[in-house]
């Protein structure tokens, strides 16, 4: 049969509230060299136990009896400390354990989860969480909104999760936990009511450097909207901005709109350029969330200036005209140039030169027409830009280079058809 246990003192019991400090103690009497005392909690050796071992010899000889006392200190009682504690020693080839002592937790409820501050859109449902535990159990919860209980008694209303169907004003929520020992109150969470996200952001009108946009404001509870903020960002060929991406890839152009009306004219834009726009509206409580990015595009405009450095020289029945692209913004894709020339008593001749920047004209009547002047205009899909001032044809001087070009014969009548362009500014000079 087994040897008698060397334990002469067993761990006691500790029951208390969280944070309590206590000590468990066991004592044994052994003959010969004292063993190391280990502590078990629920059968598991405590590897990082805050324990101290004291050994007192009862005689002069090392082989005499020793009293060994081991003390386990529990510094701040937590739920994980609860359980059955025993001392364990290995003596020779035998193992001995003490009688168990118990550590229990009993006190006011302890919150595992408390309601958190958050922002919500007006009239939008949301949930709040609260969780508490004993011991002792059960723990019943009571929710309060703006310090007013939401149920007749603890445990009767919502428990771990409170569903709020929507708020129209900023409110506070807290949670009371009740058990047999008393009541603990959670932190108070402030739920800030922000305006709803604006809806139906759309274009009202488009101009090459200007977009007019409008939107429908969302509900904002009892707080009137103070303003809305519109952001525009170059689309960068669609890179980087997906429908829901929170931040633009570069610094956006930001404009504020007084409300109402829920409309804004965005100016100083580049013509014929894709943008993404979004809008958020603000009340005294803060801003709504942004709408998704809406892709928009400014239309093409007509060139803002005439072609530059026009030179026109005449050599008998031929005239050579050349020019450079307008320095002013084209406001679109340059599709070509129109040229008009006119003599003193002859009708004006209009020509579409295409994208070339020079032309040789074959003049009728062996060049006898006097006071010939030439005008040039650039055009885009949106139409013609301004015409240049009339440039008189100068007589060609020997030594002046004249490149050989395909001759453009003056037609017998000034009537032209424009196969690719159906809208033109008519010109007289």
């Amino acid at each position: 049969q087994a040897e008698e246990s060397p334990f002469v003192g067993n761990p006691g019991n500790i029951t208390g509230a969280r944070g309590l400090t206590g000590t468990l103690r066991c004592q044994l009497q052994v003959q010969g060299e004292p063993p190391e005392v280990h502590w078990l909690r629920d059968g598991q050796i405590l590897e990082l136990a805050d324990s101290t071992q004291t050994q007192v010899p009862l005689g002069e000889d090392e082989q005499d009896d020793w009293i060994v006392v081991s003390q386990l200190r529990i510094t701040s009682l937590q739920l994980s400390d609860t359980g059955q504690y025993q001392c364990l020693v290995f003596l020779g080839h035998q193992t001995f354990v003490s009688q168990p002592g118990y550590v229990g937790l009993e006190g006011l409820p302890y919150f595992l989860e408390e309601p958190e501050d958050r922002t919500v859109a007006a009239n939008t449902p949301f949930n709040l969480s609260c969780q508490a535990q004993g011991p002792p159990e059960p723990v019943d919860l009571l929710w309060l909104q703006d310090a007013v209980p939401l149920a007749t008694a603890p445990g009767h209303g919502p428990q771990r999760s409170l569903h709020v169907p929507g708020l129209n004003k900023t409110s506070s929520f807290s949670c009371e936990a009740h058990n047999a020992k008393g009541v603990t109150t959670s932190r108070t969470a402030t739920i800030t009511v922000l305006p709803q996200q604006p809806r139906n952001l759309h274009l009202v009108s488009r101009q090459p450097t200007e977009l007019e946009v409008a939107w429908t404001p969302g509900l904002s509870g009892i707080y009137p909207l103070t303003h809305c903020t519109l952001q525009a960002v170059l689309s960068d060929d669609g890179m980087g901005i997906q429908a829901g991406e929170p931040d633009p890839p570069e610094e956006p152009l930001t404009s504020q709109a007084s409300v109402p009306p829920h409309q804004l004219r965005l100016g100083s834009l580049h013509p014929h350029t894709p943008y993404h726009i979004r809008v958020a509206c603000t009340s005294s409580q803060g801003p709504s969330s942004w709408t998704h990015w809406l892709p928009v595009e400014t239309p093409e405009g007509v060139p803002l200036g005439p072609p530059e450095n026009i030179s026109a020289t005449r050599n008998g029945s031929q005239a050579f005209v050349h020019w450079q692209e307008p320095r002013a913004p084209l406001q679109g894709t340059l599709l070509g140039y129109r040229l008009a020339y006119q003599g003193q008593d002859t009708p004006e001749v209009l020509m579409d030169i295409g994208l070339r920047q020079e032309v040789t004209l074959e003049l009728q009547g062996d060049g006898s027409v006097s006071n010939l002047t030439v005008c040039v205009a650039a055009y885009t899909a949106a139409g013609d830009g301004p015409w240049s001032l009339p440039v008189p044809l100068e007589a060609w001087r020997p030594g002046q280079a004249q490149p050989v070009h395909q001759l453009v014969k003056e037609p017998s009548t000034p009537a032209f058809s424009w196969p690719h362009h159906h809208h033109h500014h008519h010109h007289h000079h």
Partner: antibody, heavy 116, light 106 residues
Framework: QVQLVQSGAEVKKPGASVKVSCKAS????????INWVRQAPGQGLEWMGW????????KYNEKFKGRVTLTVDTSISTAYMELSRLRSDDTAVYYC?????????WGQGTLVTVSS | EIVLTQSPDFQSVTPKEKVTITCSAS?????MYWYQQKPDQSPKSLIY???NLASGVPSRFSGSGSGTDYTLTINSLEAEDAATYYC?????????FGQGTKLEIK
């Protein structure tokens, strides 16, 4: 000397329950935890749970919670393991083992075969 | 749960050879335990608290290690040591075992 003697082999049908016993001798039965560990054919060891005979307190591996029940009869120093809703993958050797922070003594094992 | 991985899974060795079995834990633990299981027998405690020999275990067996890496060493292998060896931890619940290392004598 410490001894743990287990009941004999069992053959059960799927859905049935089995109850294995483990009789302890050679030490104060109520002072030490009794654990149950199983070993499927050709496999490793898997801890199922423990019982403290002195109080009847139990702790179970989450995997077996709801299917395993550990009990003791201190008057005859015997521990029991009952496993319910048996499946074919419960076919294994079931061991009881005394623990002192580890498993210092083991029973000889009980083969439970689950087959339809 | 803490996962214990033993290496090697299988080893064939000649008597008198020195054998080392390692056990790696998925998180740091304080103590390791080792068991020997011979065919058709129940496991037997070999090493407790990382380095202490269980009752009746020959001194050729030893254990060492800390943190996540632990070792069982058999200094001069004998024929009777043919068995499967398991490491085990109980630093956190549930207690878990390694997959085992089968030792065969050539």
């Amino acid at each position: 000397q410490v001894q743990l003697v287990q009941s004999g082999a069992e053959v059960k049908k799927p859905g049935a329950s089995v109850k294995v016993s483990c009789k302890a001798s050679g030490y104060p039965f109520t002072d030490f935890y009794i654990n149950w560990v199983r070993q499927a054919p050709g496999q490793g060891l898997e801890w199922m749970g423990w019982i403290y005979p002195g109080s009847g307190n139990t702790k179970y591996n989450e995997k077996f919670k709801g299917r395993v029940t550990l009990t003791v009869d201190t008057s005859i120093s015997t521990a029991y393991m009952e496993l319910s809703r048996l499946r074919s993958d419960d076919t294994a050797v079931y061991y009881c083992a005394r623990s002192t922070g580890f498993f210092d003594y083991w029973g000889q094992g009980t083969l439970v075969t689950v087959s339809s | 749960e803490i996962v214990l991985t033993q290496s090697p899974d299988f080893q064939s060795v000649t008597p008198k050879e020195k054998v080392t079995i390692t056990c790696s834990a998925s998180s740091s633990i304080g103590y390791m335990y080792w068991y020997q299981q011979k065919p058709d027998q129940s496991p037997k405690s070999l090493i407790y608290l990382t380095s202490n020999l269980a009752s009746g275990v020959p001194s050729r067996f030893s254990g060492s290690g800390s943190g996540t890496d632990y070792t069982l060493t058999i200094n001069s292998l004998e024929a009777e040591d043919a068995a499967t060896y398991y490491c085990q931890q109980w630093s956190s619940n549930p207690p878990t075992f390694g997959q085992g290392t089968k030792l065969e004598i050539k």
